[in-house]
């Protein structure tokens, strides 16, 4: 039994790490292997994760973790019974994937104007509270044409466009990302979508 | 807003015993390591002891033996028992949270020995 | 064990002025591992500084933190009033465990 594509791992930086790997063969990750994962730090203990099969040869991880700092590096040792295949290291706040935005919510009682609101997905105590950025995906379900992205870059997780912007008696789904500049952070995956029928008072053309 | 509210402080005799409490509000208590500090009056900090998220301990070697360091996670609450307590144990002790660093502090609370 | 040093003992400046504040190891340390605090007269110590250069949330950028090795810099580029205080430097070693330098004293000249 040998590693085909060796374990890569992503954090979420609050409590979660993601890892991944390819075996050489058709595995039953949960049986046959094991990952022991441990904070480089005096007040740590060694932690054992149970992979799941993702794919014939392939297995998923999810390491439960301390609130992460950015000084944060863990060691990473996979088994299969008394073998060690492989052992690397893993430090979180280098590979960072952040959580979905969520309650996404979109506001059509104000005058012509769409207000589209989300949660931001971590605590005020964590760093990355106040540096994400989100990304609102906006499509029309009639025309996949009709697809479009605001990029907001300010702090508060909200979107005003007017109604007018988009076309009206139709509906639309909405759905948001986010990712933090300041660590250099892949896309998080889009938050659940949200729909809504456009509509607006067309302007009375002058003739 | 995170929030570390400290307890337990008193006068207490030479070879006496206290308990110190420090309760946690606004961060997820239990991912999170705790620390004491302390500062004799007039005098620098001195880290005295810490807990690991999993119960691992580490202490000074200036109070081993005698302080006991504890954590209830369903409690949000961190503990110090002190025990054999030495005039050079007087101090403003803080609770603190962190790892490598201390992120934030309690606002502390007096502990005198003195017979 | 780690001790860390710091200099000078008291510094007296006036508001306006840049403050330089050292901190010296007797052995090489981390920058990852490398803190300095602000405390002021009975209040709990303020992190300031954390991985010898990232400033903690809240603090002004007058603020910065630099060196490597066995030498670091806590630099307030222009006081303020409300920095007249102690500062500390703190470090982590992962079989020492935490130590502080004994602080220095900025005080009004």
């Known amino acids: 039994m040998k590693v085909l594509q060796e374990p890569t791992c992503v954090s979420d930086y609050m409590s979660i790490s993601t890892c991944e790997w390819k075996m050489n063969g058709p595995t039953n990750c949960s049986t046959e292997l094991r990952l022991l994962y441990q904070l480089v730090f005096l007040l740590s203990e060694a932690h054992t994760c149970i992979p799941e099969n993702n794919g014939g040869a392939g297995c998923v991880c999810h390491l439960l973790m301390d609130d992460v700092v950015s000084a944060d590096n863990y060691t990473l040792d996979l088994w299969a019974g008394q073998q060690l295949l492989w052992k690397g290291s893993f430090k979180p706040s280098e590979h960072v994937k952040p959580r979905a935005p969520g309650n996404l919510t979109v506001h059509t009682n104000v005058s012509d104007t769409l207000l589209l609101t989300w949660s931001n997905p971590y605590p005020p105590d964590n760093y990355l509270y106040n540096h994400l950025t989100y990304a609102v995906n906006i499509w029309s379900e009639n025309d996949p044409a009709d697809f479009r992205i605001y990029n907001v870059t300010y702090l508060e997780p909200s979107l005003r466009i007017a109604a007018s912007t988009l076309k009206s008696g139709i509906s639309y789904r909405a759905r948001v990302r986010a990712w933090a500049q300041c660590y250099n952070t892949t896309w998080s995956e889009w938050s659940p979508s949200t729909k809504w029928h456009n509509s607006y008072r067309e302007p009375f053309e002058q003739h | 807003e995170v929030q570390l509210v400290q307890s337990g402080g008193g006068l207490v005799h030479p070879g006496g015993s206290l308990r110190l409490s420090c309760a946690g509000s606004?961060?997820?208590?239990?991912?999170?390591?705790m620390f004491w500090v302390r500062q004799a009056p007039g005098k620098g900090l001195e880290w005295v002891s810490g807990i690991g998220t999993g119960g691992a301990t580490s202490y000074a070697d200036s109070v081993k033996g005698r302080f006991t360091i504890s954590r209830d996670n369903a409690k949000n609450s961190l503990y110090l028992q002190m025990n054999s307590l030495r005039a050079e144990d007087m101090a403003v002790y803080y609770c603190a949270r962190g790892r490598y660093w201390y992120n934030n502090w309690g606002q502390g609370t007096l502990v005198t020995v003195s017979s | 064990e780690i001790v860390l040093t710091q200099s000078p003992g008291t510094l007296s400046l006036s508001p306006g002025e840049r403050a330089t504040l050292s901190c010296r190891a007797s052995?090489?340390?981390?920058?990852?591992?490398l803190a300095w605090y602000q405390q002021k007269p009975g209040q709990a110590p303020r992190l300031l500084i954390y991985?010898?250069?990232s400033r903690a949330p809240g603090i002004p950028d007058r603020f910065s933190g630099s060196g490597s090795g066995t030498d670091f810099t806590l630099t307030i580029s222009r006081l303020e009033p409300e920095d007249f205080a102690v500062y500390y430097c703190q470090q982590y070693d992962h079989s020492a465990g935490w130590t502080f330098g004994q602080g220095t004293k900025v005080e009004i000249k």
């Open positions: 606004g961060f997820t208590f239990s991912r999170n390591a």
């Open positions: 052995q090489s340390v981390s920058n990852s591992y």
């Open positions: 991985g010898a250069s």
